[in-house]
């Protein structure tokens, strides 16, 4: 799903207040709900009719450093006989997410939000057929 | 997928540098890759064999203010005849994502990262059958 543009209003102080110095803001240390965890069924990526694999990207100057991307294994979907049915489509499900980028020069460390497109998994879709004239 | 614990090292300065004052850091204004967009097909949530609905939650003190959650429409999956097949399962696909929480007291505005669990869509899964003795 889409993350709207900041419009630079969310991070601004109220109009009656002095502006933020140097184009930066105060980010408190610590993460709210840090212990919250995904509770997805085990092996969902292998048991789905539109199965997928995971690829891990790693960047030590990004939080989270590990970002996992899914790739659909097939063009079609897997039927009850375990065979690929190309009349159906394995389609990626994407999500816009935020990460934090760390930038440092010597002891001066600053952070910036970055938008990342993550493919979270795949779903099986019945396409509408059109015959082109 | 899971976001690891901060371990409070990512946001720390190198050991040889003076510590961050007041437990906060500098967050630069602006978002990297802000114009990046999800390119998911229209109506994927209706054409899927494990269809889902969307619910929008809105919070003006969160960025993004709008967070969209998916809910699977059925327990089973939709077969080629358009009927629900309860021998298969519609299963939510979840993703841990970061949002920014805004906290203000008068003209003092600070921000904090928050972890949010988002259900992005649903996939159709073949259940493992166990007969309990």
């Amino acid at each position: 799903r889409k993350i709207p543009k900041v419009g630079h209003t969310f991070f601004q102080k109220p109009e009656s207040c002095p502006p933020v110095p140097g184009g930066s803001m105060k980010l408190d240390i610590g993460i709210i709900n840090e212990n919250q965890r995904v509770s997805m069924s085990r092996n969902i990526e292998s048991r789905s009719t539109s199965p997928w694999n995971y690829t891990v990207t790693w960047d030590p100057n990004r939080y989270p450093s590990e970002v996992v991307q899914a790739q659909c294994r097939n063009l079609g979907c897997i039927n009850a006989q375990g065979k690929e049915d190309i009349s159906m489509n394995s389609v990626p499900i994407q999500q816009e997410t935020l990460v934090v980028r760390r930038k440092h020069q010597g002891c001066s460390v600053s952070f910036q939000l970055e938008k990342v497109l993550v493919t979270v998994g795949c779903t099986c879709v019945t396409p509408v057929i059109h015959h082109v004239q | 997928r899971k976001i690891p614990k901060v371990g409070h090292t990512f946001f720390q300065k190198p050991e040889s540098c003076p510590p961050v004052p007041g437990g906060s850091m500098k967050l630069d204004i602006g978002i990297i890759n802000e114009n990046q967009r999800v390119s998911m097909s229209r109506n994927i949530e209706s054409r899927s064999t494990s269809p889902w609905n969307y619910t929008v939650t809105w919070d003006p003190n969160r960025y993004p203010s709008e967070v969209v959650q998916a809910q699977c429409r059925n327990l089973g999956c939709i077969n080629a005849q358009g009927k629900e097949d309860i021998s298969m399962n519609s299963v939510p696909i979840q993703q841990e994502t970061l949002v920014v929480r805004r906290k203000h007291q008068g003209c003092s505005v600070s921000f904090q990262l928050e972890k949010v669990l988002v259900t992005v869509g649903c996939t159709c899964v073949t259940p493992v059958i166990h007969h309990v003795q």
């Epitope: 489509n89 389609v91 396409p127 509408v128 059109h130 | 097909s41």
Partner: nanobody
Framework: EVQLVESGGGSVQAGDSLRLSCAAS????????FGWFRQTPGKEREFVAG????????EYANSVKGRFTISRDNAKNTVDLQMDSLKPEDTAVYYC?????????WGQGTQVTVSS
């Protein structure tokens, strides 16, 4: 509306090569995959080859594996099917298919005839 223009069909001898091309135009954005099916009289259309747009992942029917190669040109919205070591049983009408995940477009087809 989406248009598909197929080209490259014709008549060849067994063992020869042919190259089919398909160009998509119109509202052909958010491509999922692009590929080819074929049909012989009295039989169902069968999948031949497909290529995923995002990462160039390819799939082939067992009957053409090692002989046919599918490739794509993202900039031009085209897909090519290089058919080598053709056999008489490859004789069919070949249909270009453009898949946009929830909608699938079929071309009008181009005849390939392989004689022994």
């Amino acid at each position: 509306e989406v248009q598909l223009v197929e080209s490259g069909g014709g008549s060849v001898q067994a063992g020869d090569s042919l190259r089919l091309s398909c160009a998509a135009s119109g509202r052909a954005n958010s491509i999922n995959w692009f590929g080819w099916f074929r049909q012989t009289p009295g039989k169902e259309r069968e999948f031949v080859a497909g290529i995923r747009w995002s990462d160039a992942y390819t799939e082939y029917a067992n009957s053409v594996k090692g002989r046919f190669t599918i490739s794509r040109d993202n900039a031009k919205n085209t897909v090519d099917l290089q058919m080598d070591s053709l056999k008489p049983e490859d004789t069919a009408v070949y249909y270009c298919v453009l898949d946009l995940s929830t909608v699938r477009y079929w071309g009008q087809g181009t005849q390939v005839t392989v004689s022994s």
